[in-house]
Interface confidence: medium
């Protein structure tokens, strides 16, 4: 039975040209994590495999950095990076757990003045 749960950073926003860390955390299971895939729509961004180590897909290697931990850092963000990102945890013996993150990349001025992060 799959008892684990994936906690993610949820819906996040970041400035165009900036960077963002995508993080997922698998909890409530003793299953062994054998591989984590990071995917965006139909494209594989990166793999972190227990045996293979990190592998960044060629089309993203200039803008994607592994870590921290099993997370992924996206750099030099563009508006086209807006969308859904998935962390896919392959585990043994449980199977596959998936977390979803929605990233919105905003023009600098919008991000600076976004109500979501304003401090009174």
């Amino acid at each position: 039975m799959m008892t684990g749960t994936i906690e993610t950073t949820g819906n996040i926003s970041a400035e165009k040209g900036g960077s963002i860390i995508l993080q997922c955390h698998l909890s409530s299971t003793t299953a062994q994590v054998t591989q984590v895939n990071w995917e965006q729509q139909d494209q594989l961004l990166a793999i972190c495999n227990a045996d293979l180590g990190w592998h960044i897909s060629p089309s993203f290697k200039d803008r994607v950095a592994p870590g921290p931990g099993l997370g992924l850092t996206l750099q030099s963000l563009t508006v086209n990076d807006t969308g859904e990102y998935f962390c896919i945890y392959h585990t043994y013996p449980d199977g596959t757990y998936t977390g979803r993150i929605f990233l919105e990349v905003l023009e600098s001025s919008v991000a600076e003045h976004g109500a979501r992060f304003q401090i009174p």
């Epitope: 895939n37 594989l44 495999n49 045996d51 293979l52 180590g53 990190w54 592998h55 060629p58 998935f86």
Partner: antibody
Framework: QVQLVQSGAEVKKPGASVKVSCKAS????????IEWVRQAPGQGLEWIGV????????NYNEKFKGRATITADKSTSTAYMELSSLRSEDTAVYFC?????????????WGQGTTVTVSS | DIVMTQSPDSLAVSLGERATINCKSS????????????LAWYQQKPGQPPKLLIY???TRESGVPDRFSGSGSGTDFTLTISSLQAEDVAVYYC?????????FGGGTKLEIK
């Protein structure tokens, strides 16, 4: 263009080892995982294992663990698959393949295949 | 390991007719989180390596004619050739790329009737 050129046919005696090479060209060798797949005469396809040429990390089909060793030489852009303790049922065509960015198990680029015959 | 079972083992179809090949996996290849099926179809002609036709159960690889289509989800998948051409004579394989070890079906040999 992308090319994977494999070494020539081999005839081996039972108990011996064979080392098949796969020389890559037309792309950055460390950017893509290299997989090995075999096909016995008149049979289907069997996945042997994978290497990340960037890190040297490997992952094997449990069936081949301890008998197959996959390595990569970055200086010559060549991947190798060595199979030891050969038996007659290892007679097969051995293929190397390169995945593409839609997923870590899809192989649009293949070597031409290397025929390994195990016979006393 | 995920076991992939193809049917039929062989199939004879007239030129211009529809050919249908089925593939069943022992575990679901659907990732419910992103709604993607991790299933691919390959075509192999004698003396050649396999050629990727379809991935994600239904997405054609670039350059593959649109008479080839894939469908299905979870554990049941189908490859359809809408109008068989002489050059389609080959063995067709389905493949799990959901989890290691990647496993292939036993193959379906397609011939002209």
């Amino acid at each position: 263009q992308v090319q994977l050129v494999q070494s020539g046919a081999e005839v081996k005696k039972p108990g011996a080892s064979v080392k098949v090479s796969c020389k890559a060209s037309g792309y950055a060798f460390t950017d893509y995982l290299i997989e090995w797949v075999r096909q016995a005469p008149g049979q289907g396809l069997e996945w042997i294992g994978v290497i990340n040429p960037g890190s040297g990390g490997t992952n094997y089909n449990e069936k081949f663990k301890g008998r197959a060793t996959i390595t990569a030489d970055k200086s010559t852009s060549t991947a190798y698959m060595e199979l030891s303790s050969l038996r007659s049922e290892d007679t097969a065509v051995y293929f190397c393949a390169r995945y593409h960015y839609y997923g870590s198990g899809l192989f649009p680029y293949w070597g031409q295949g290397t025929t390994v015959t195990v016979s006393s | 390991d995920i076991v992939m079972t193809q049917s039929p083992d062989s199939l004879a179809v007239s030129l211009g007719e529809r050919a249908t090949i089925n593939c069943k996996s022992s575990q679901s290849l659907l990732n419910s989180g992103n709604q993607k099926n991790y299933l691919a179809w390959y075509q192999q002609k004698p003396g050649q390596p396999p050629k990727l036709l379809i991935y994600g159960a239904s997405t054609r690889e670039s350059g593959v004619p649109d008479r080839f289509s894939g469908s299905g989800s979870g554990t049941d998948f189908t490859l359809t050739i809408s109008s068989l051409q002489a050059e389609d004579v080959a063995v067709y394989y389905c493949q799990n790329y959901h989890s290691y070890p990647f496993t292939f079906g036993g193959g379906t040999k397609l011939e002209i009737k």
